[in-house]
């Protein structure tokens, strides 16, 4: 069971300092941006991270949404990352959900975060290069200290 607590506006970056944004095709991508680029591209660079109280604290249960024309929420249904047009719900009466991720810190580095899917244990949000694009994907953790599954989250409120 997940009960919604509060939401924060955040900029999410990979460890190469590329900024996560949602493109015109609703795809989550990473791109090099200056701070002014990041501001100019808002609200596509500003993510609503909603925190949920988990009946079994396994990390901070969160949803990740973006508000362009409408609110869309990140989903990992069938292990495929996409934004679905929906508001983060107030309650989820289940222990798993395609839109809930466990946000966890890295010991000694409070600003480094990982996001594990609540639906698929051991699968994490990751940045992966595909041709010229840096995409947000769901990836099985497979190696020590994998930097591709680590992100920084900068609160904007």
């Amino acid at each position: 069971y997940f009960g919604k607590l509060e939401s924060k506006l955040s900029v999410i970056r990979n460890l190469n300092d590329q900024v996560l944004f949602i493109d015109q095709g609703n795809r989550p991508l990473f791109e090099d941006m200056t701070d002014s680029d990041c501001r100019d591209n808002a609200p596509r660079t500003i993510f609503i991270i909603s925190m949920y109280k988990d009946s079994q604290p396994r990390g901070m249960a969160v949803t990740i949404s973006v508000k362009c024309e409408k609110i869309s929420t990140l989903s990992c249904e069938n292990k495929i990352i996409s934004f679905k047009e929906m508001n983060p719900p107030d309650n989820i009466k289940d222990t798993k959900s395609d839109i809930i991720f466990f946000q966890r810190s890295v010991p000694g580095h409070d600003n480094k975060m990982q996001f594990e899917s609540s639906s698929y244990e051991g699968y994490f949000l990751a940045c992966e290069k595909e041709r010229d694009l840096f995409k947000l994907i769901l990836k099985k953790e497979d190696e020590l200290g994998d930097r591709s599954i680590m992100f920084t989250v900068q609160n904007e409120d």
Partner: antibody, heavy 120, light 107 residues
Framework: QVQLVQSGAEVKKPGSSVKVSCKAS????????ISWVRQAPGQGLEWMGG????????NYAQKFQGRVTITADESTSTAYMELSSLRSEDTAVYYC?????????????WGQGTLVTVSS | DIQMTQSPSSLSASVGDRVTITCRAS??????LNWYQQKPGKAPKLLIY???TLQSGVPSRFSGSGSGTDFTLTISSLQPEDFATYYC?????????FGQGTKVEIK
């Protein structure tokens, strides 16, 4: 740098209660867990329970359920552990330890420990 | 609760020795296991998390391996400052438990 500073040593009588405090500084308090871990003389580490201040409610190890109360005051970044119905076997060093963001999946910062002696 | 069993409970070794400590969980815990070092009169110190990831600042002679129920902490070449007690900790479920500890003493 995160620092956890605990209250001083206590001597208590059997049947009484003890309340130990843990003041955090240098980091985010509300979203990171604070746990209490005890260590009896010459014994191992025992997780008693913990709290994620933003959630408000604590989680307890089965062994201590009903006898321990863990609370947190976000305004002062202080966590508290109260243990009631004390017996001689509760004589131990009590540590507070800061855990991960929203959970108890590691302890990377520890307090200096508080010795609680239960003796008649 | 998940039970953690460490072996041996104590061992004697010399500087330069390779030391191996094992930890067994009563059920599968994936890679949700940490290792701590504790010296007398001091608080424990996190060495390794998620089974095999070295905490920053910890010497590379420490390594962890294993997944599921069986885990190992290895010190490749024991140094004088490594004589201490080592604990494993599982966090597969929100309620966390420690192993009973392994004391590494000077031979």
């Amino acid at each position: 740098q995160v620092q956890l500073v605990q209250s001083g040593a206590e001597v208590k009588k059997p049947g009484s209660s003890v309340k130990v405090s843990c003041k955090a500084s240098g980091g985010t308090f509300s979203t990171f867990s604070i746990s209490w871990v005890r260590q009896a003389p010459g014994q191992g580490l025992e997780w008693m329970g913990g709290i994620i201040p933003i959630f408000g409610t604590a989680n307890y190890a089965q062994k201590f359920q009903g006898r321990v109360t863990i609370t947190a005051d976000e305004s002062t970044s202080t966590a508290y552990m109260e243990l009631s119905s004390l017996r001689s076997e509760d004589t131990a060093v009590y540590y507070c330890a800061r855990g991960g963001y929203g959970g108890y999946y590691y302890f990377d910062y520890w307090g200096q420990g508080t010795l609680v002696t239960v003796s008649s | 609760d998940i039970q953690m069993t460490q072996s041996p409970s104590s061992l004697s070794a010399s500087v330069g020795d390779r030391v191996t400590i094992t930890c067994r969980a009563s059920q599968s815990i994936s890679n949700r296991l940490n290792w701590y070092q504790q010296k007398p009169g001091k608080a424990p110190k996190l060495l390794i998390y998620k089974g095999s990831t070295l905490q920053s600042g910890v010497p590379s002679r420490f390594s962890g391996s294993g997944s599921g129920t069986d885990f190992t902490l290895t010190i490749s070449s024991l140094q004088p400052e490594d004589f201490a007690t080592y604990y494993c900790q599982q966090h597969y479920v929100w309620s966390t438990t420690f192993g009973q500890g392994t004391k590494v003493e000077i031979k």
